[in-house]
Interface confidence: medium
């Protein structure tokens, strides 16, 4: 009788990574003949919440208005029309900062380093931890894993850059998480400033942060070379 | 105002093929769905399959095997096509816009008549 | 699917007098969304069908107010007051609620 409905398509306002106590509204956009939408959390009981669609019936708001622990986890989203359910959307991963202190993200030998050259960022945790995330800002692809195996807990992660080219230039910082829920994040380390000088076989400038522009190189996934400095951390690409 | 015109062949043999054009006007096709419902001489109404807005569609599960609705959304025309008939599809075949509040028909075509006959 | 038993089949009432049609439905037409999707059709000779009322009892625009339709679940009411000569034709009931969507058999107006 029905061919399947076509997905929809969910996604976060103001963005998928929401600091403790912040608001987040999540949208589910479906079709005008929607009925109503159903939001699934992943090991909650389905449905997680129920709406009837906004006019004109082709989208629905769900409303989180101080993010906590509980809401951190990955969601999926329904609508219903005449003919009944449709696909699930892609995956929505919702994800808390502010769960665990600071880390400290420093550039080793220094943050000003010569294209060409190598550069370690090191983020350090005051507690253990298994996971550690760097994030590039205004990257499209901003995560690089660094989790522990056999649940070894670390102080620490490099995340070796060799060799540096005037695309690393940028802002970063980093993340430490436990890994029973990479859904919840510390609080950000304070930013890092990551400067390339001297890019004499690149003679791009070092893309300006101020303006965000079309997709760059800047926008791939930051893809350090080398080992991984320590034994009991494997690398995860996101 | 809104407006739906059905046109097509009006005496078709039987296991011959017909194809139906509604055109609209009032209205876009990118926002509302368009239902098709045919009434046989002196019977009742029988809905047989809709477009949506998005272009999905769905069927009549007695006769979704011999039935195709599309759509051009540019030119406003959605299209019924309808194989293999027989003498009992004789009737009046409307197109009708989907109203989206009440899920209901709002508008109507004023139909086209059909007669399959040797 | 959901059969739609409309009584009468026939209806005679004389001009000014009430008409009342009757509608069940095989299920309970009361959606998860909370709202009842049974609509009613008037369907003069020689004419397309016309949509007199929506969600169980909304007049379309352009519909008199002697009309009233009520009811909920499976039993529904197309009531018109005081019947007039162009209030004769043909009167169906059809839900929306479940795919696929079904017309009642229909019910004929006519002048005593």
């Known amino acids: 009788q029905a061919g399947p409905l076509p997905k929809p398509t969910l996604w976060a306002e103001p963005g998928s990574v929401i600091s403790w106590g912040n608001s987040v509204t999540i949208w589910c956009q479906g079709t005008l003949e929607a009925r109503e939408y159903r939001l699934d959390k992943e090991e909650s009981p389905a449905p997680w919440d129920r709406q009837n669609p906004l006019e004109p019936k082709n989208k629905a708001r769900f409303s989180i208005p101080s993010m906590t622990e509980d809401y951190a986890g990955r969601y999926r989203c329904y609508y219903r029309s005449p003919v009944g359910w449709s696909q699930p959307s892609d995956p929505l991963e919702l994800v808390m900062t502010g769960a665990y202190s600071k880390p400290t993200l420093s550039a080793l030998p220094s943050p000003l380093v010569t294209s060409g050259k190598s550069v370690t960022l090191l983020c350090q945790s005051r507690s253990p931890m298994d996971t550690f995330l760097l994030i590039k800002e205004r990257a499209a692809h901003p995560l690089l894993h660094l989790r522990s195996e056999h649940g070894a807990q670390q102080h620490q992660a490099e995340f070796p850059m060799s060799p540096v080219t005037s695309v690393h230039g940028g802002t970063y910082r980093c993340f430490s998480s436990h890994g029973f829920s990479h859904y919840l994040l510390s609080h950000p380390s304070d930013p890092l400033e990551l400067i390339v000088s001297g890019s004499l076989e690149d003679p791009r400038p070092s893309p300006t942060r101020s303006v965000s522009t079309a997709a760059g190189p800047e926008d791939q996934p930051l893809m350090p070379t080398g080992s991984v400095p320590h034994s009991g951390l494997r690398r995860h690409w996101e | 105002q809104v407006q739906l015109k059905e046109s097509g062949p009006v005496l078709v043999a039987p296991s011959q093929s017909l194809s139906i054009t509604c055109t609209v006007s009032g209205f876009s096709l990118t926002n509302s769905a368009v239902h098709w419902v045919r009434q046989p001489p002196g019977k009742g109404l029988e809905w047989l399959g809709v477009i949506w807005a998005g272009g999905n569609t769905n069927y009549n599960s007695t006769l979704m095997s011999r039935l195709t609705i599309n759509k051009d959304n540019s030119k406003s025309q959605v299209f019924l096509r309808m194989n293999s008939l027989q003498t009992d599809d004789t009737a009046i075949y409307y197109c009708?816009?989907?109203?989206?509040?009440?899920?209901?028909?709002?508008?109507w075509g004023q139909g086209t008549t059909l007669t399959v006959s040797s | 699917d959901v059969v739609m038993t409309q009584t009468p089949l026939t209806l005679s009432v004389t001009i000014g007098q009430p008409a009342s049609i009757s509608c069940r439905s095989s299920?309970?037409?009361?959606?998860?969304?909370?709202?009842?999707?049974l609509n009613w059709l008037f369907q003069r000779p020689g004419q397309s069908p016309k949509r007199l009322i929506y969600l169980v009892s909304k007049l379309d625009s352009g519909v008199p107010d002697r009309f009233t339709g009520s009811g909920s679940g499976t039993d529904f009411t197309l009531k018109i007051s005081r019947v007039e000569a162009e209030d004769l034709g043909v009167y169906y009931c059809w839900q929306g609620t479940h795919f696929p969507f079904t017309f009642g058999s229909g019910t004929k107006l006519e002048i005593k």
């Open positions: 009708a816009k989907h109203e989206t509040y009440g899920d209901s028909f709002d508008y």
């Open positions: 299920q309970s037409l009361l959606d998860s969304d909370g709202k009842t999707y």
